[in-house]
Each structure stands twice: as C-alpha cells, then as structure tokens.
Interface confidence: low
C-alpha cells in the first residue's frame, strides 16, 4: 500500500532556459509518498521542457539527500529517438524507472523498501545532443517510510558499584516508545526511562539498575505494531545472558 | 503469416468475471508490447490497457483500473485480460493490438520504437447483462 | 488524461474529391499522434504514425501532418474503398486515447 500526498507541487521556472512562452522547464513532484518498509513505493515525477518535440539523446537521474550535488540512486540514458532508457545506476539494484522520459515521465520505483531509505529524492533530466539542457527538482519529494517496531539490540552491562544496567534499542516510524518490566519494577511498567534517546528512527532506553535477579523484558511499541525482548541476569551465577 | 487471436468473450453477469486471452504467431511476441483495445456497439475506440514487452510496465484506463488486470506469458505467446466486477458499460468488443518493437543486440535491448498499433486481432465480444 | 477531439464527426466526399480530418490534443503531445481506419465488422488498421510516417503498405494517397496540439489526416484522392471511419489516437501519455472518429461518407 503507497500513499501519495501531493500537498504542493514544484513548478518553478528555470531563468537560465531562454524558452517560449508555451512550455517552460517545470517539475511536478508530491511533496511526500509514504509507505510501509519491505515494500515498494512510487515516486512520481513528470516535466514540462522548452524544447518542441526534443528526440535526442536523454539522461534521467534520481539523487538523494539534497539536489544537484546529493548522490545518485538511479540513472539510465535513452538514445535518439529511443523509448527505451538503458539502466546505468540502480543502487543495490532497487530503484527502477516506472515512467517513460520520452513521455516527459521520470517516475521511479523504489523495491524492498528500508528505514534507512526515508529521505529526501530529486529527479533530474539532462538532454544532449543538437539541444544541450537541463533540469532538476529543487524541493524533491520526501519518501516517508513507516515501520512497526524491531529491537536490534538488548543487553545487560557492567555498571557503577557492581552494579549493572540494561540497554534496550529499537527502530521504528513513527519512533516506538519503549517500556522495561521486570523484577520490582511492576508487570508491563509503561515508564520509559528518562534516559531514553532517540537518533533518527533509533530509540534506546537504559534501566540504569538492575537490583533483581531474573528476566527484564523490554517492549517497543508504535500505531503499527509492538516488540519485545528480554534479558535474564543471575547474579550469584556469574553471568548474564540475553533471550530474544 | 503475422496474428493475433482473440478469445475467451461470451455473456457474463454483472459484478462476474472472464478472462480473454491473446495468442501471438509469425513474429517474435516477446519483443513487442501488447494493447488490448475495446469498442462498445455503435461507438468509437476505448483504450483498456497496456503490458511492456517484458511485462514490467503495466498501464490501464481509468474506467477499469483496479478491475481489470493485464498480464502475458511469452513462453507460450499469449496476452491475457482478467476482468472482474465486470459492469454493462464493459459491453464490448475486445481486440489485441501490438505496439513499438524493441531491438536486441546479443541479448541486450539498445533500443524501443514506438510505431502506433500496427497489428490487430479479429475481436472477441464481451456481453455483460442480467 | 489528454482528451482527443476530431472533427468532423461525419464528412462526405465524393471519390477523387480531397479530404482533411481534424484531430486536436487537450494539451501538447509532440508528434505522438497515429490514424487508424476502420471499416464496418473489422479491426482498426494503422495509417499513420508519428503524425507523418506512413505506415508501410499504405498508399501514399494518405497523409499525416501537425505537431503539439493540432493534426490533421489528408486522403488527396478518395477511392471507394477509403469510404470508413478514421480515428486519431494519442501515445503520449500512458492512456493512449483516441479520438471519437470521423466518418467518411460517399456523397
């Protein structure tokens, strides 16, 4: 399931284009397309140009992060008079063009769909040949990808005076909250640490003190979804170990 | 000599289903994308759908996205449309129709034409009625 | 969508007489124009594609001219088998539309 939202669109005149007055360099992109990780998602992107009928060679580019100088996630070249643009760049071989650029179509198609991919992408199409010009997004659109919780990381350390504490991380969007339940603490305590930090899509919360022995479960939950994981601590044994 | 064959039509119900099926013969059925393209009685020329030589792009009309599905298998040369919750205004009948031809150069395809819908199947009607 | 529109919608002509159909684009749509004819029971046959380029096999008594928004089909010596119905149709974008179609008639 992809959700467009098209809140505004970009149409923004490129100066430098000396063009008629009919048909101006335009971009017309939404301003977020959301999706669910492991997914697929659209991004669309069609352009208006100043240049009749152009049939040259051609060049589509998708960057990511920011425009003009952001990295290239996708790039394919279509020769004089082709409908067909030859794939350059497919980074980790994901993105594929979905539109026609002939057809003033850039739209692309984003495969197995990861946290790590919401961000900011801006389409960008160069001619060459008899006509030398070209044309980028400057807005781009966001793509929002949305996650039920995963907890990459549980673990029992040594802390202050013998003592030990727990560290729990786990990734999600929206954020999930997370919430220790243990030995004294009460069943299903919803009292997130306030040493809980969030980086990105990264939430980590710390038990700063494990005072029994016995199995501390963390639980990450968001509007999507929850997770637990949980970690044992026997003192007297010597050790700790951790069960997900 | 070069075809295409339209089958599968007949009287179905409305909100039923039917699938029409296109077989290719006397050219390369792979290297070329496929149309299906209806006309109700009396009336003019509808596009219904489009399928890429590969079967990687996949387009459709609006009066039958999400109804209707184009799919090919070209192992065996043949196009098919699977049509459901079909309505009276579905009434019609269903021609196949090649389009632009890819070119191939040890394997690789270097290049895609556009050269308007240069063959036709005979048709196949479709009837929808209580 | 791009909307098709020709004109006129029927048109009578005597053979040898010069024929022009109209066919106009909503919005440009480059040279991405094709034109079918169609006779009563049959299938569409291609004329014309890339608004000029005569399909092979098709007398060159037929003509295709325009670019952007306006097309137009010449058939500079009617014969008695060109008497059907003529369609333009757009491939622009990816909802190939047609025209509405014109008939020609013997007058």
């Known amino acids: 399931f992809v959700r467009t939202k098209i809140d505004t669109t970009e149409n923004l005149l490129n100066t430098e284009v000396h063009s008629s007055p009919a048909q101006r360099w335009s971009m017309q992109v939404p301003a977020e397309v959301s999706a669910a990780a492991g997914d697929a998602a659209v991004l669309p992107c069609t352009f208006t140009h100043p240049h009749r009928h152009y049939d040259g060679p051609l060049t589509a580019i998708w960057r990511a992060g920011e425009p003009y100088a952001g990295p290239q996630v996708f790039r394919c070249a279509a020769a004089r008079g082709s409908e067909l643009c030859q794939t350059a760049l497919s980074l980790h071989g994901r993105f594929r063009l979905l539109g026609n650029p002939r057809r003033n179509d850039l739209s692309l198609r984003v495969e197995r769909l990861a946290l790590a991919d919401d961000r900011r992408y801006f389409c960008r199409v160069e001619f060459a040949g008899d006509v030398h010009d070209r044309y980028e997004s400057r807005h781009g659109v966001r793509l929002h990808v949305t996650a039920a919780p995963r907890i990459i990381n549980i673990s029992v350390l040594p802390g202050p005076a013998h003592a030990f504490r727990a560290l729990c991380t786990a990734e999600g969007e929206p954020p999930p909250a997370l919430a220790w339940s243990g030995p004294a603490l009460g069943n299903g305590s919803a009292a997130v640490p306030s040493s809980g930090q969030g980086h990105g899509h990264l939430v980590t919360a710390e038990l700063p003190a494990l005072n029994h022995d016995g199995r501390y479960t963390c639980t990450a939950a968001n509007s999507l979804g929850r997770s637990e994981a949980s970690v044992y601590l026997f003192r007297f044994h010597g050790a700790s170990g951790a069960s997900t | 000599q070069v075809q295409l064959v339209e089958s599968g039509g007949g009287v179905v119900q409305p909100g039923r289903s039917l699938r029409l099926s296109c077989v290719a013969s006397g050219f390369t059925f792979s290297t070329y994308g496929i149309h299906w393209v209806r006309q109700a009685p009396g009336k003019g020329l509808d596009w219904v759908s489009v399928i890429w030589y590969d079967g990687s792009h996949k387009y459709y009309a609006d009066s039958v996205q999400d109804r209707f599905t184009i799919s090919r298998d070209n192992s065996k040369n043949t196009l098919y449309l699977q049509m459901n919750s079909l309505r009276a205004e579905d009434t019609a009948v269903y021609y196949c129709a090649r389009e632009g031809m890819i070119t191939m150069v040890r394997g690789v395809i270097i290049d895609y034409q556009y050269h308007g819908m240069d063959v036709w199947g005979q048709g196949t009607t479709v009837t929808v009625s209580s | 969508d791009i909307q098709m529109t020709q004109s006129p919608s029927t048109l009578s002509a005597s053979v040898g007489d010069r024929v022009t159909i109209t066919c106009r684009a909503s919005q440009s749509i480059g040279r991405r124009l094709a034109w079918y004819q169609q006779k009563p029971g049959k299938a569409p046959k291609l004329l014309i594609y890339?608004?000029?380029s005569l399909e092979s096999g098709v007398p060159s008594r037929f003509s295709g001219s325009g670019s952007g928004t306006e097309f137009t089909l010449t058939i500079s010596s009617p014969q008695p088998d060109d008497f059907a119905t003529y369609y333009c149709?757009?491939?622009?974008?990816?909802?190939?539309?047609f025209g509405q179609g014109t008939k020609l008639e013997i007058k």
């Open positions: 890339k608004a000029s």
């Open positions: 149709q757009q491939y622009h974008s990816y909802s190939y539309t």
